[in-house]
Amino acid sequence: LQDPCSNCPAGTFCDNNRNQICSPCPPNSFSSAGGQRTCDICRQCKGVFRTRKECSSTSNAECDCTPGFHCLGAGCSMCEQDCKQGQELTKKGCKDCCFGTFNDQKRGICRPWTNCSLDGKSVLVNGTKERDVVCGPSP
Protein backbone atom coordinates (compact mmCIF):
# COMPACT_ATOMS: atom_id res chain seq x y z
CA LEU A 1 0.00 0.00 0.00
CA GLN A 2 1.35 3.40 -0.96
CA ASP A 3 1.94 5.85 1.91
CA PRO A 4 -0.48 8.77 1.32
CA CYS A 5 2.24 11.09 2.65
CA SER A 6 4.30 10.36 -0.45
CA ASN A 7 1.90 12.67 -2.32
CA CYS A 8 3.09 15.64 -0.27
CA PRO A 9 5.72 17.50 -2.31
CA ALA A 10 8.99 19.07 -1.18
CA GLY A 11 8.20 22.33 0.58
CA THR A 12 5.39 20.71 2.57
CA PHE A 13 5.15 18.25 5.42
CA CYS A 14 2.68 15.50 6.19
CA ASP A 15 1.12 14.68 9.55
CA ASN A 16 -0.02 11.07 10.03
CA ASN A 17 -2.25 12.19 12.88
CA ARG A 18 -4.23 14.39 10.51
CA ASN A 19 -5.22 11.93 7.77
CA GLN A 20 -2.03 12.59 5.82
CA ILE A 21 -2.83 16.25 5.15
CA CYS A 22 -0.04 18.17 3.39
CA SER A 23 0.81 21.51 4.99
CA PRO A 24 3.20 24.15 3.64
CA CYS A 25 6.47 24.55 5.51
CA PRO A 26 6.31 27.68 7.69
CA PRO A 27 8.68 30.56 6.91
CA ASN A 28 12.35 29.83 7.57
CA SER A 29 11.88 26.07 7.33
CA PHE A 30 12.17 23.58 4.49
CA SER A 31 11.60 20.02 3.34
CA SER A 32 13.90 18.95 0.56
CA ALA A 33 12.00 15.79 -0.41
CA GLY A 34 8.38 14.74 -0.69
CA GLY A 35 6.59 12.79 2.02
CA GLN A 36 8.45 14.35 4.94
CA ARG A 37 6.80 14.32 8.37
CA THR A 38 8.35 17.62 9.44
CA CYS A 39 10.01 20.67 7.97
CA ASP A 40 13.54 21.40 9.14
CA ILE A 41 14.50 24.82 10.46
CA CYS A 42 16.67 26.73 8.00
CA ARG A 43 20.33 27.06 8.86
CA GLN A 44 21.25 30.63 9.82
CA CYS A 45 24.63 31.94 8.74
CA LYS A 46 25.64 34.21 11.60
CA GLY A 47 28.81 35.66 13.06
CA VAL A 48 31.84 34.48 11.14
CA PHE A 49 29.55 32.58 8.73
CA ARG A 50 27.91 34.38 5.83
CA THR A 51 25.12 33.25 3.53
CA ARG A 52 26.26 31.70 0.26
CA LYS A 53 22.77 30.50 -0.71
CA GLU A 54 19.50 31.60 0.87
CA CYS A 55 17.17 29.04 2.40
CA SER A 56 14.04 28.16 0.44
CA SER A 57 11.02 26.05 1.28
CA THR A 58 12.71 23.12 -0.49
CA SER A 59 16.41 23.52 0.36
CA ASN A 60 18.52 24.60 3.30
CA ALA A 61 20.66 27.71 3.40
CA GLU A 62 24.35 27.24 2.62
CA CYS A 63 27.04 29.16 4.45
CA ASP A 64 30.62 30.10 3.76
CA CYS A 65 33.04 32.16 5.85
CA THR A 66 33.67 35.88 6.07
CA PRO A 67 36.95 37.18 4.57
CA GLY A 68 39.94 36.11 6.63
CA PHE A 69 38.41 32.71 7.37
CA HIS A 70 37.86 29.50 5.42
CA CYS A 71 35.45 26.59 5.67
CA LEU A 72 36.14 23.33 7.42
CA GLY A 73 33.97 20.24 7.69
CA ALA A 74 31.05 18.96 5.66
CA GLY A 75 28.79 21.78 4.51
CA CYS A 76 31.11 24.37 6.04
CA SER A 77 30.29 23.41 9.61
CA MET A 78 33.22 25.47 10.95
CA CYS A 79 35.18 28.55 9.96
CA GLU A 80 38.93 28.59 10.61
CA GLN A 81 41.14 31.65 10.55
CA ASP A 82 43.29 32.16 7.45
CA CYS A 83 47.05 32.51 7.80
CA LYS A 84 49.49 33.97 5.28
CA GLN A 85 51.37 31.77 2.85
CA GLY A 86 54.46 30.54 4.68
CA GLN A 87 52.50 30.10 7.93
CA GLU A 88 50.31 27.52 9.66
CA LEU A 89 47.59 27.90 12.26
CA THR A 90 48.50 26.69 15.75
CA LYS A 91 46.71 26.96 19.08
CA LYS A 92 48.65 30.19 19.61
CA GLY A 93 47.68 31.64 16.23
CA CYS A 94 49.51 31.88 12.90
CA LYS A 95 53.18 30.84 13.09
CA ASP A 96 55.85 30.91 10.39
CA CYS A 97 56.81 27.59 8.85
CA CYS A 98 59.96 26.08 10.36
CA PHE A 99 63.07 25.92 8.15
CA GLY A 100 62.73 23.03 5.75
CA THR A 101 58.94 23.30 5.52
CA PHE A 102 56.55 25.40 3.43
CA ASN A 103 52.88 26.26 3.00
CA ASP A 104 51.71 27.81 -0.26
CA GLN A 105 48.09 28.30 0.92
CA LYS A 106 46.23 30.37 3.50
CA ARG A 107 45.10 27.20 5.21
CA GLY A 108 46.55 23.84 6.17
CA ILE A 109 49.87 22.93 7.71
CA CYS A 110 53.50 23.45 6.75
CA ARG A 111 54.84 20.49 4.75
CA PRO A 112 58.45 19.39 4.35
CA TRP A 113 60.32 20.45 1.24
CA THR A 114 60.71 17.73 -1.35
CA ASN A 115 63.92 15.73 -0.90
CA CYS A 116 65.28 15.89 -4.43
CA SER A 117 68.07 13.39 -3.70
CA LEU A 118 65.54 10.62 -3.06
CA ASP A 119 64.76 10.75 -6.79
CA GLY A 120 68.39 11.13 -7.67
CA LYS A 121 67.91 14.77 -8.58
CA SER A 122 69.52 17.99 -7.45
CA VAL A 123 67.96 21.16 -6.09
CA LEU A 124 67.39 23.59 -8.96
CA VAL A 125 65.61 26.30 -6.92
CA ASN A 126 65.87 26.51 -3.15
CA GLY A 127 62.70 26.21 -1.09
CA THR A 128 61.22 29.03 0.99
CA LYS A 129 58.53 29.19 3.68
CA GLU A 130 56.02 29.78 0.87
CA ARG A 131 57.37 27.50 -1.88
CA ASP A 132 58.67 23.98 -2.23
CA VAL A 133 62.07 23.37 -3.70
CA VAL A 134 62.28 22.82 -7.44
CA CYS A 135 64.19 19.68 -8.33
CA GLY A 136 66.44 19.75 -11.39
CA PRO A 137 68.14 17.12 -13.48
CA SER A 138 70.37 14.51 -11.92
CA PRO A 139 73.70 15.95 -10.71
Epitope: P24, P26, P27, K53
Partner: antibody
Protein backbone atom coordinates in the same frame (compact mmCIF):
# COMPACT_ATOMS: atom_id res chain seq x y z
CA UNK B 1 15.52 41.93 -2.91
CA UNK B 2 12.53 39.62 -3.34
CA UNK B 3 10.05 40.96 -5.90
CA UNK B 4 6.80 39.57 -7.24
CA UNK B 5 5.06 41.52 -9.99
CA UNK B 6 1.60 40.51 -11.17
CA UNK B 7 0.12 41.47 -14.53
CA UNK B 8 -2.74 40.55 -16.84
CA UNK B 9 -5.70 41.97 -14.94
CA UNK B 10 -8.38 44.07 -16.56
CA UNK B 11 -12.05 44.15 -17.48
CA UNK B 12 -13.57 40.86 -18.69
CA UNK B 13 -17.14 39.93 -19.55
CA UNK B 14 -18.86 37.13 -17.61
CA UNK B 15 -18.02 33.79 -19.19
CA UNK B 16 -14.77 35.20 -20.54
CA UNK B 17 -11.16 34.15 -19.96
CA UNK B 18 -8.00 35.82 -18.72
CA UNK B 19 -4.44 34.78 -17.93
CA UNK B 20 -2.57 36.38 -15.05
CA UNK B 21 1.21 36.32 -14.73
CA UNK B 22 3.53 36.81 -11.79
CA UNK B 23 7.19 37.61 -12.52
CA UNK B 24 9.51 36.66 -9.68
CA UNK B 25 13.00 37.93 -8.92
CA UNK B 26 15.43 38.17 -6.02
CA UNK B 27 15.08 34.54 -4.93
CA UNK B 28 15.44 31.04 -6.34
CA UNK B 29 11.97 30.75 -7.84
CA UNK B 30 12.36 27.07 -8.76
CA UNK B 31 12.85 26.17 -5.09
CA UNK B 32 9.57 27.66 -3.84
CA UNK B 33 5.99 26.58 -4.16
CA UNK B 34 3.72 29.47 -5.12
CA UNK B 35 0.20 30.63 -4.29
CA UNK B 36 -2.44 32.82 -5.83
CA UNK B 37 -4.58 34.69 -3.27
CA UNK B 38 -7.35 37.12 -4.10
CA UNK B 39 -9.17 39.93 -2.32
CA UNK B 40 -12.58 41.20 -3.43
CA UNK B 41 -13.17 44.94 -2.92
CA UNK B 42 -13.39 45.72 0.83
CA UNK B 43 -13.30 42.01 1.69
CA UNK B 44 -10.87 39.58 3.30
CA UNK B 45 -8.16 37.46 1.68
CA UNK B 46 -9.16 34.25 -0.12
CA UNK B 47 -6.66 31.60 -1.14
CA UNK B 48 -7.10 30.51 -4.76
CA UNK B 49 -4.45 27.97 -5.75
CA UNK B 50 -1.06 26.46 -4.98
CA UNK B 51 1.63 24.88 -7.16
CA UNK B 52 4.67 23.05 -5.80
CA UNK B 53 8.22 24.08 -6.70
CA UNK B 54 8.50 21.59 -9.56
CA UNK B 55 4.87 21.92 -10.64
CA UNK B 56 3.93 18.32 -9.83
CA UNK B 57 1.46 19.09 -7.03
CA UNK B 58 -1.44 21.50 -7.45
CA UNK B 59 -4.30 22.46 -5.13
CA UNK B 60 -7.32 24.66 -5.84
CA UNK B 61 -10.02 26.33 -3.79
CA UNK B 62 -13.40 24.66 -4.41
CA UNK B 63 -14.78 27.93 -5.84
CA UNK B 64 -12.33 27.90 -8.77
CA UNK B 65 -11.79 24.17 -9.34
CA UNK B 66 -12.38 23.24 -12.99
CA UNK B 67 -12.28 26.87 -14.10
CA UNK B 68 -8.80 28.06 -13.09
CA UNK B 69 -5.44 26.49 -13.91
CA UNK B 70 -2.24 27.36 -12.08
CA UNK B 71 1.08 26.74 -13.84
CA UNK B 72 4.68 27.92 -13.77
CA UNK B 73 7.71 28.33 -15.98
CA UNK B 74 10.79 27.93 -13.80
CA UNK B 75 13.11 28.83 -16.69
CA UNK B 76 11.41 32.22 -16.92
CA UNK B 77 10.75 32.66 -13.17
CA UNK B 78 7.07 33.16 -13.88
CA UNK B 79 3.84 31.94 -12.30
CA UNK B 80 0.54 31.87 -14.20
CA UNK B 81 -3.18 31.67 -13.47
CA UNK B 82 -5.38 30.81 -16.46
CA UNK B 83 -8.98 31.72 -15.65
CA UNK B 84 -11.99 30.63 -17.69
CA UNK B 85 -15.79 30.81 -17.29
CA UNK B 86 -15.33 33.96 -15.26
CA UNK B 87 -18.10 35.17 -12.97
CA UNK B 88 -18.81 38.51 -11.33
CA UNK B 89 -17.74 37.02 -7.97
CA UNK B 90 -14.25 36.52 -9.39
CA UNK B 91 -13.82 40.30 -9.37
CA UNK B 92 -10.88 40.93 -7.05
CA UNK B 93 -7.30 42.00 -6.62
CA UNK B 94 -5.15 38.93 -7.38
CA UNK B 95 -1.87 38.49 -5.52
CA UNK B 96 0.86 35.92 -5.98
CA UNK B 97 2.86 34.86 -2.95
CA UNK B 98 5.61 32.33 -2.38
CA UNK B 99 4.70 29.30 -0.29
CA UNK B 100 6.07 30.72 2.97
CA UNK B 101 3.42 33.42 2.32
CA UNK B 102 6.02 35.94 3.43
CA UNK B 103 6.27 38.01 0.25
CA UNK B 104 3.32 39.16 -1.83
CA UNK B 105 3.20 41.00 -5.13
CA UNK B 106 1.51 44.38 -5.50
CA UNK B 107 -1.52 42.68 -7.08
CA UNK B 108 -3.40 42.94 -10.37
CA UNK B 109 -7.07 43.88 -10.53
CA UNK B 110 -9.56 41.68 -12.37
CA UNK B 111 -13.04 43.05 -12.98
CA UNK B 112 -15.71 40.72 -14.35
CA UNK B 113 -18.66 42.76 -15.56
CA UNK B 114 -20.90 43.09 -18.57
CA UNK C 1 -12.75 24.07 5.57
CA UNK C 2 -11.25 25.75 8.61
CA UNK C 3 -12.95 29.06 9.39
CA UNK C 4 -10.90 31.87 10.91
CA UNK C 5 -12.95 34.44 12.83
CA UNK C 6 -11.41 37.79 13.75
CA UNK C 7 -12.63 40.26 16.31
CA UNK C 8 -13.34 43.08 16.58
CA UNK C 9 -14.14 44.11 13.01
CA UNK C 10 -12.64 47.52 13.69
CA UNK C 11 -11.20 49.49 16.59
CA UNK C 12 -10.15 53.09 17.21
CA UNK C 13 -7.01 53.65 19.26
CA UNK C 14 -4.80 56.51 20.38
CA UNK C 15 -1.06 56.55 19.78
CA UNK C 16 0.75 54.78 22.61
CA UNK C 17 -2.17 52.55 23.58
CA UNK C 18 -1.94 48.77 23.81
CA UNK C 19 -3.93 46.90 21.16
CA UNK C 20 -5.11 43.29 21.29
CA UNK C 21 -6.60 41.61 18.22
CA UNK C 22 -8.24 38.20 18.38
CA UNK C 23 -8.43 35.34 15.89
CA UNK C 24 -10.30 32.08 16.49
CA UNK C 25 -10.06 28.93 14.38
CA UNK C 26 -13.06 26.63 13.93
CA UNK C 27 -10.83 23.64 14.73
CA UNK C 28 -7.39 22.95 16.14
CA UNK C 29 -4.71 24.42 13.86
CA UNK C 30 -1.78 23.87 16.21
CA UNK C 31 0.49 26.89 15.93
CA UNK C 32 0.14 27.26 12.16
CA UNK C 33 -1.25 30.78 12.25
CA UNK C 34 0.22 33.91 10.67
CA UNK C 35 -0.68 37.58 11.06
CA UNK C 36 -0.52 40.07 8.18
CA UNK C 37 -0.66 43.85 8.08
CA UNK C 38 -2.28 45.48 5.06
CA UNK C 39 -2.19 49.24 4.58
CA UNK C 40 -4.67 50.95 2.22
CA UNK C 41 -3.99 50.17 -1.45
CA UNK C 42 -1.04 47.95 -0.51
CA UNK C 43 -0.42 44.21 -0.45
CA UNK C 44 -0.33 42.26 2.84
CA UNK C 45 2.93 42.11 4.81
CA UNK C 46 3.82 39.18 7.06
CA UNK C 47 4.19 40.18 10.72
CA UNK C 48 4.00 36.93 12.69
CA UNK C 49 4.27 33.28 11.65
CA UNK C 50 3.98 30.07 13.65
CA UNK C 51 1.63 31.97 16.02
CA UNK C 52 4.45 33.74 17.85
CA UNK C 53 7.52 34.18 15.60
CA UNK C 54 8.19 37.75 14.56
CA UNK C 55 9.15 37.95 10.88
CA UNK C 56 12.40 39.61 9.81
CA UNK C 57 12.35 43.37 10.28
CA UNK C 58 9.06 43.50 12.19
CA UNK C 59 9.23 45.90 15.18
CA UNK C 60 9.19 44.20 18.58
CA UNK C 61 6.03 46.06 19.61
CA UNK C 62 4.19 43.35 17.59
CA UNK C 63 3.74 40.10 19.52
CA UNK C 64 1.79 36.99 18.58
CA UNK C 65 0.53 34.34 20.99
CA UNK C 66 -1.87 31.42 21.23
CA UNK C 67 -2.25 27.87 19.96
CA UNK C 68 -4.91 25.37 18.92
CA UNK C 69 -7.96 27.60 18.30
CA UNK C 70 -7.32 30.94 20.04
CA UNK C 71 -4.74 33.42 18.79
CA UNK C 72 -3.84 37.00 19.66
CA UNK C 73 -1.85 39.78 18.04
CA UNK C 74 -0.74 42.46 20.50
CA UNK C 75 0.70 45.86 19.61
CA UNK C 76 2.28 47.06 22.85
CA UNK C 77 2.27 50.76 21.97
CA UNK C 78 0.42 51.59 18.79
CA UNK C 79 2.04 54.06 16.38
CA UNK C 80 0.43 56.18 13.67
CA UNK C 81 2.08 53.96 10.99
CA UNK C 82 0.27 50.92 12.43
CA UNK C 83 -3.06 52.12 11.00
CA UNK C 84 -4.01 49.22 8.74
CA UNK C 85 -6.10 46.10 8.33
CA UNK C 86 -4.80 43.04 10.18
CA UNK C 87 -5.51 39.55 8.85
CA UNK C 88 -4.88 36.20 10.47
CA UNK C 89 -4.49 33.08 8.36
CA UNK C 90 -3.96 29.37 8.94
CA UNK C 91 -1.56 27.12 7.04
CA UNK C 92 -2.45 23.99 9.01
CA UNK C 93 -4.10 22.47 5.97
CA UNK C 94 -5.39 23.26 2.50
CA UNK C 95 -7.36 25.23 1.64
CA UNK C 96 -5.44 27.99 3.39
CA UNK C 97 -7.98 30.27 5.02
CA UNK C 98 -7.91 33.82 6.37
CA UNK C 99 -10.01 35.86 8.74
CA UNK C 100 -12.12 38.76 7.46
CA UNK C 101 -9.66 41.22 9.01
CA UNK C 102 -9.65 43.84 11.76
CA UNK C 103 -9.39 47.50 10.78
CA UNK C 104 -7.23 49.53 13.16
CA UNK C 105 -8.08 53.24 13.11
CA UNK C 106 -6.72 56.21 15.03
CA UNK C 107 -9.00 58.19 17.33
Amino acid sequence: EVQLVESGGGLVKPGGSRKLSCAASGFTFSEFGMHWVRQAPDKGLKWVAYISSGGSTIYYADTVKGRFTISRDNAKNTLFLQMTSLRSEDTAMYYCARDWVDYWGQGTTLTVSS
Amino acid sequence: NIVMTQSPKSMSMSVGERVTLSCKASENVGSYVSWYQQKPEKSPKLLIYGASNRYTGVPDRFTGSGSATDFTLTISSVQAEDLADYHCGQSYSYPLTFGAGTKLELK
